[in-house]
């Protein structure tokens, strides 16, 4: 289920300090967790609608087994959820840009 109507979707955003850790989007809210040097890191951000490709299974919403768990959702602040850290450790992916945080 996608975002409602034409109303902007409000999401938690870990990098949006000046906007009170909130971003606004026409797409989805995303939260991702990974394990780096034994530390859990959550990244929360907005994904614009144009970047939700391919339809049905957008790249930005896919988890990477043993590397990163990711959850996309479509209601205000739904990405405040905490995810379980994957069982593996973060290795350098072949295509880092695909999994990098979205600003």
């Amino acid at each position: 289920s996608g975002p409602r109507g034409v109303q902007a979707l409000l999401c938690a955003c870990t990098s949006c300090l000046q906007a009170n850790y909130t971003c606004e989007t026409d797409g989805a809210c995303m939260v991702s967790i990974f394990n780096l040097d034994g530390m859990e890191h959550h990244v929360r951000t907005c994904i614009p609608k144009v970047e939700l490709v391919p339809a049905g299974k957008p790249f930005y919403c896919l988890s990477s087994e043993d590397l990163r768990n990711t959850h996309c959702c479509y209601t205000d602040y739904c990405n405040r959820i905490d995810l379980r850290v994957p069982s593996g450790h973060l290795k350098e992916p072949e295509h880092p840009s695909m999994w990098g945080p979205v600003e």
């Epitope: 988890s63 209601t75 602040y77 379980r84």
Partner: antibody, heavy 119, light 108 residues
Framework: QVQLQESGPGLVKPSQTLSLTCTVS??????????WSWIRQHPGKGLEWIGY???????YYNPSLKGRVTISVDTSKNQFSLKLSSVTAADTAVYYC???????????WGQGTLVTVSS | SSELTQDPAVSVALGQTVRITCQGD??????ASWYQQKAGQAPVLVIY???KRPSGIPDRFSGSSSGNTASLTITGAQAEDEADYYC???????????FGGGTKLTVL
Amino acid sequence: QVQLQESGPGLVKPSQTLSLTCTVSGGSISSGGYYWSWIRQHPGKGLEWIGYIYYSGSTYYNPSLKGRVTISVDTSKNQFSLKLSSVTAADTAVYYCAREEVGDWFDPWGQGTLVTVSS
Amino acid sequence: SSELTQDPAVSVALGQTVRITCQGDSLRKYYASWYQQKAGQAPVLVIYGKNKRPSGIPDRFSGSSSGNTASLTITGAQAEDEADYYCNSWDSSGNHVVFGGGTKLTVL
């Protein structure tokens, strides 16, 4: 401490619309940080999540009930409501309202209200 | 059928330790929360997130996760712990909230 209380008719005729209201006391729906949810429990069975609303009006529904469910909020009355259309006997259940922490745990719950669908 | 699977019934001797489990693919990614429901009453949250306990819940209740299984452990079960216990989380596609079928705990 936040408390929730369900209210509405205990008997609804088949094909009609079930309407329930949850009144929140001890806290404001508008304070943010929570979803306001409806959950039901068929007699002698497990729990089924129906859907939730954020004070902004942002809603999310169980896909299995989508199309029949509408959840709305009235921040001025500190209430949120459930409407379930085209009911059948299979919708007979105890209906609970609950506050949902974003992260999907429910606390607290209302005491529940039994709604029977019968002619 | 539920996407979260629980044993229908479990029993424990008074004062002993019991573990109630909840299985599902989604639990590799999402935390489960746990609810206690006594006969004729509304459910009460007992464990949420990464083994967090709401205020007022005794410390004999604890939670853990491994692989696709979440567990609720009661260490030193009391007579008042006799109840139905439900887990909940997201479904495997992350589309909606689901509950397990429930486990009836009997304290002998």
